[in-house]
Interface confidence: low
C-alpha cells in the first residue's frame, strides 16, 4: 500500500478547521475490516486518531479530530482537525496498514492574522520640530511572530531607534508592540507595517504630524 500526502504544509487559521490530506489506493475487494489507520504526532508518536478492527476508534487528541468515514473505503484517510490552536502546529504522520503498510507525514502550520495597528504618540501635544517623540505601533492576536517595518512619508525605511516586543497570550497568539523614537521634522508621516510571514498579510498603521492636530 502506498500512502500519499500533500508535500506543502497545510496552513490553518486559529479557530478554523483544517484537513490533513492522506490517501491510499485500495486493492479490489478491499474492506474496512482490513484497515488499520493511525494518525499520530510525528515527533512524539502521540496517538491522534485511529481506525482499527473495522471501526473508528475516535479521537485521542483533545476530542477535536475526525475522519471521513464514508470516504475511507475509497482510500481517503484524511484527518479533520477542528478549532485549530497554536499548539496543534507540527508534523502529523498518517500510517496505513492493510496487508503491508506505509506512512507519510504532513505538516500543519498554524496562523492568525494581525489586527490593524493602533498608533500612539508620546508626548502627544505641544510638539515642535526637533522634539524627540515616541511612536508606538500595536497590533494584536497574530501568529506566528510578526515582522515589523517602519517608513517615513517618502517611503524610506526607518531602522534606527526601533524596539519591537512580542508577547504571547494564553492561546499562544502574539501581541506586537513596536516603538519608534524619532526627532520631528517640520511635518511628516510615520507608518508601520505589521506582516504575518506565513499569511503574507500586511496590516498598516500611520500617524501624520503637521503641527496640530495629529492625524491617525
Amino acid at each position: 500500500v502506498e500512502v500519499q500526502v500533500s508535500e506543502d504544509p497545510v496552513v490553518a487559521l486559529v479557530d478554523t478547521d483544517a484537513t490533513l490530506r492522506c490517501s491510499f489506493s485500495p486493492e479490489p475487494g478491499f474492506s474496512l475490516a482490513q484497515l488499520n489507520l493511525i494518525w499520530q504526532l510525528t515527533d512524539t508518536k502521540q496517538l491522534v486518531h485511529s481506525f482499527t478492527e473495522g471501526r473508528d476508534q475516535g479521537s485521542a487528541y483533545s476530542n477535536r479530530t475526525a475522519l471521513f468515514p464514508d470516504l475511507l473505503v475509497q482510500g481517503n484517510a484524511s484527518l479533520r482537525l477542528q478549532r485549530v490552536r497554536v499548539t496543534d502546529e507540527g508534523s502529523y504522520t498518517c500510517f496505513v496498514s492493510i496487508q503491508d503498510f506505509d506512512s507519510a507525514a504532513v505538516s500543519l502550520q498554524v496562523a492568525a492574522p494581525y489586527s490593524k495597528p493602533s498608533m500612539t504618540l508620546e508626548p502627544n501635544k505641544d510638539l515642535r520640530p526637533g522634539n524627540m517623540v515616541t511612536i508606538t505601533c500595536s497590533s494584536y492576536q497574530g501568529y506566528p511572530e510578526a515582522e515589523v517595518f517602519w517608513k517615513d512619508g517618502q517611503g524610506v525605511p526607518l531602522t534606527g531607534n526601533v524596539t519591537t516586543s512580542q508577547m504571547a497570550n494564553e492561546r499562544g497568539l502574539f501581541d506586537v508592540h513596536s516603538v519608534l523614537r524619532v526627532v520631528l521634522g517640520a511635518n511628516g508621516t510615520y507608518s508601520c507595517l505589521v506582516r504575518n510571514p506565513v499569511l503574507q498579510q500586511d496590516a498598516h498603521g500611520s500617524v501624520t504630524i503637521t503641527g496640530q492636530p495629529l492625524t491617525f
Partner: antibody, heavy 122, light 108 residues
Framework: EVQLLESGGGLVQPGGSLRLSCAAS????????MSWVRQAPGKGLEWVSS?????????YYADSVKGRFTISRDNSKNTLYLQMNSLRAEDTAVYYC??????????????WGQGTTVTVSS | EIVLTQSPGTLSLSPGERATLSCRAS??????LAWYQQKPGQAPRLLIY???TRATGVPDRFSGSGSGTEFTLTISSLQSEDFAVYYC??????????FGGGTKVEIK
C-alpha cells in the same frame, strides 16, 4: 552530538558588567528559540530571557533583569549571548543556556549547557 | 504571572518505591507543563513535556498526568539514579516562563 557550551562567567563587582556566550553545535542553531535560565546558590531555576528564531530576533526578559540584561544571537556563529549590565548581588547564580523544543515560541527546553557561574560581590 | 507550587519539598523514599510529585498552578495552564530532573552539579534534564509526553531517552518508569491546575509526576519504581531534584515548568502564559520551587527526592 547536540551541545551547548557557556562561557564568560566570573567575579564582578556590583554595578559591573559581564557578557556570557553560549556556543551551539550539533544542530541547526537558527531553527530554535534559545533561552537563558539561572540558578542562585541553593535555589531553584529562574527563567531570565529568551530570543526568537528570526523576524529580527524578538526578545523576552524576566522583570528582574529588564533594562539591565540584553539577549542576542549570531546565527552565523551559532552563538547566543547575554550582556549583563548594572549587576547586583542577587544576580549571583549559575547561568544556563538552553534550547527550546519549539521553533515558534517558548515552551520546554530539551538541551542545556553545563552552566557558567557569575558571582557579584565587592 | 503564573505561580507553580510543588509539593512536597522533600520526599524520602527507598529504591524500588513509587514516587508521586505534585505541581499546582495558580491558574489553568491546560496541559502546557514540563518536568525536569536535576542532579547536584549538573544541568537540568527535560523529562516530560505537554504534561504526559516523555522526552527522548527518558525511561518509561517516569510518567506525567493532570491538566488545568493540578499535575503529577510519577516514578513507578525508584532507581538509584532517580534521586535528584525535580522541577515543573509552565509555558501556557509567557513571558515569564515560570518554574516550581522543586521537589527533592532523597534516599530514605
Amino acid at each position: 552530538e547536540v551541545q551547548l557550551l557557556e562561557s564568560g562567567g566570573g567575579l564582578v563587582q556590583p554595578g559591573g558588567s559581564l557578557r556570557l556566550s553560549c556556543a551551539a553545535s550539533g544542530f541547526t542553531f537558527s531553527d530554535y528559540y534559545m533561552s537563558w535560565v539561572r540558578q542562585a546558590p541553593g535555589k531553584g531555576l529562574e527563567w531570565v530571557s529568551s530570543i526568537s528564531i528570526s523576524y529580527g530576533g524578538t526578545t523576552y526578559y524576566a522583570d528582574s533583569v529588564k533594562g539591565r540584561f540584553t539577549i542576542s544571537r549570531d546565527n552565523s556563529k551559532n552563538t547566543l549571548y547575554l550582556q549583563m549590565n548594572s549587576l547586583r548581588a542577587e544576580d549571583t547564580a549559575v547561568y544556563y543556556c538552553a534550547r527550546d523544543r519549539s521553533p515558534y515560541q517558548c515552551r520546554s527546553m530539551d538541551v542545556w549547557g553545563q552552566g557558567t557561574t557569575v558571582t557579584v560581590s565587592s | 504571572e503564573i505561580v507553580l507550587t510543588q509539593s512536597p519539598g522533600t520526599l524520602s523514599l527507598s529504591p524500588g518505591e513509587r514516587a508521586t510529585l505534585s505541581c499546582r498552578a495558580s491558574q489553568s495552564i491546560r496541559s502546557d507543563l514540563a518536568w525536569y530532573q536535576q542532579k547536584p552539579g549538573q544541568a537540568p534534564r527535560l523529562l516530560i513535556y505537554n504534561t504526559v509526553t516523555r522526552a527522548t531517552g527518558v525511561p518509561d518508569r517516569f510518567s506525567g498526568s493532570g491538566s488545568g491546575t493540578e499535575f503529577t509526576l510519577t516514578i513507578s519504581s525508584l532507581q538509584s539514579e532517580d534521586f535528584a531534584v525535580y522541577y515543573c515548568q509552565q509555558y501556557n502564559s509567557w513571558p515569564p516562563l515560570t518554574f516550581g520551587g522543586g521537589t527533592k527526592v532523597e534516599i530514605k
